[in-house]
């Protein structure tokens, strides 16, 4: 439906740095009208680092996570904080720097091959928007030897875009975050205009793919002041009219 398209907002407009979630995007979002009834955000708190406002981890850089800056601080005020290095305390995966994950409250290396039995209780600790992909793990013990680093396929639960297979990003859908396809040329996207409001989104779109940016769809049949959809378009410096 038109409503669901217009309310399917992009997470960000630029591709993420290699191997991780995107950096600081500008964002503007709208909740789907009339049907959902969010009961409020309750976030825990952690130490201060830098004052970039955020609502979820995906809005922060690959070496950051989103949380309230002080213990017991205002849950509504969150900023991007520096990730925790190996052996530092953590409450969830997103707090740990890339290459690490949160196990028993401590950031540990995820470089070695971790098996299902070793991480059964440490896949993720909730703290804001936190869902680690378990794609490739069966919860049946007979299939427990699949590797932790198996990339999530479409529809798999994820924590960040680097959890997802190539061509996919980690985006919110209903009350989870799942791997969805990165947008292709011509697909509808949302140009974000406001920072720190991703918590309102329930249907996030991925960012536009490499070489594309989210721009107003050129439609000469519409008046210039009418609202127009944004689509993923090839990068152009300027639109010059060349005479051949």
């Amino acid at each position: 439906t038109l409503n669901s398209v217009l309310n399917s907002n992009a997470i960000k407009n630029l591709p993420p740095p290699l191997g991780g979630a995107a950096g600081h995007p500008g964002s503007a979002v709208s909740a789907a009208p009339g049907i959902l009834y969010p009961g409020g955000n309750k976030y825990q708190t952690i130490d201060n680092y830098q004052p970039y406002p955020c609502a979820e981890d995906e809005e922060c850089g690959t070496d950051e996570y989103c949380a309230s800056p002080t213990r017991g601080g205002d849950a509504g005020v969150q900023i991007c904080l520096a990730c925790r290095k190996r052996r530092k305390r953590c409450m969830r995966h997103a707090m740990c720097c890339p290459g690490n994950y949160c196990k028993n409250g401590i950031c540990v290396s995820s470089d070695q091959n971790h098996f299902r039995g070793e991480i059964e209780e440490t896949i993720t600790e909730s703290f804001g928007n936190d869902h680690s992909t378990l794609d490739g793990y069966s919860r049946r013990t007979t299939l427990s030897s699949k590797m932790y680093h198996t990339k999530g396929q479409e529809g798999s639960v994820c924590l960040r875009s680097s959890d997802c297979a190539s061509g996919l990003c980690c985006a919110r859908h209903f009350w989870s975050k799942i791997c969805k396809p990165v947008l292709k040329e011509g697909q509808v996207c949302t140009k974000h205009r406001r920072k720190g409001s991703h918590g309102l989104e329930i249907f996030q779109r991925c960012y536009c793919g490499e070489g594309l940016s989210c721009r107003i769809q050129k439609d000469h049949h519409q008046a210039s002041n009418s609202s127009r959809l944004h689509t993923c378009q090839r990068h152009h410096h300027h639109h010059h009219h060349h005479h051949h």
Partner: antibody, heavy 117, light 111 residues
Framework: EVQLVESGGGLVQPGGSLRLSCAAS????????ISWVRQAPGKGLEWVAS???????YYPDSVKGRFTISRDNAKNSLYLQMNSLRAEDTAVYYC???????????WGQGTTVTVSS | EIVLTQSPATLSLSPGERATLSCRAS??????????MNWYQQKPGQAPRLLIY???KQGSGIPARFSGSGSGTDFTLTISSLEPEDFAVYYC?????????FGGGTKVEIK
């Protein structure tokens, strides 16, 4: 092994209240979305409420304002506070979670709620 | 909300036969390049069990005889060769829009 065990069902009069619980084990409970889905006798399935890993709550129109979903991550427990119960709320109530994909991929065995005078 | 209509209401087949169940949505359940259609199996007195998600992806531990197909508004669950334990009620469910909705179910019974 992932386990979800519901409790708290029973017989209640119209207008009454009931609190359902769901005890979870076998996964890091706090990280995942978890929901209540119900099934009236001899009928199909109906989504009732959900709570995300980031503690947002969601309801359909049919129960909004009457039911409240909540979770206690320290106790690995999910709750459904049901007020102003109606005969049409009579059903088996299941807790279900989304661990590997966006669908309801793990379910409890359900607890029966009967609203009758 | 999106209404899902399943057909037939009842399917009478013998073990070893192929079962084809249909689910039609009142509007497309495709978005983000994914078909948000899921299938569940429910046996009497038991909780539902996820068989298929995203129209064609198998849930954990689901036998290969269960497969899903379709996109947009029309979806099919196929059981290639019915086993005795497959006789149950099957529900489709969409996750494209809130509220997530279920179909009325198809009962697969022994002929």
């Amino acid at each position: 092994e992932v386990q979800l065990v519901e409790s708290g069902g029973g017989l209640v009069q119209p207008g009454g209240s009931l609190r359902l619980s769901c005890a979870a084990s076998g996964f890091t409970f706090s990280s995942y979305a978890i929901s209540w889905v119900r099934q009236a006798p001899g009928k199909g399935l109906e989504w009732v409420a959900s709570v995300s890993g980031w503690m947002d709550t969601y309801y359909p129109d049919s129960v909004k304002g009457r039911f409240t979903i909540s979770r206690d991550n320290a106790k690995n427990s999910l709750y459904l506070q049901m007020n102003s119960l109606r005969a049409e709320d009579t059903a088996v109530y299941y807790c279900a979670t989304s661990l590997e994909n966006y669908a309801f991929d793990y379910w409890g065995q359900g607890t029966t709620v009967t609203v009758s005078s | 909300e999106i209404v899902l209509t399943q057909s037939p209401a009842t399917l009478s087949l013998s073990p070893g036969e192929r079962a084809t169940l249909s689910c039609r949505a009142s509007e497309s359940v495709d978005d983000f390049g994914i078909s948000f259609m899921n299938w569940y199996q429910q046996k009497p007195g038991q909780a539902p069990r996820l068989l298929i998600y995203a129209a064609s992806k198998q849930g954990s531990g689901i036998p290969a005889r269960f497969s899903g197909s379709g996109s947009g508004t029309d979806f099919t669950l196929t059981i290639s060769s019915l086993e005795p334990e497959d006789f149950a009620v099957y529900y489709c469910q969409q996750s494209k829009e809130v509220p997530p909705t279920f179909g009325g179910g198809t009962k697969v019974e022994i002929k």
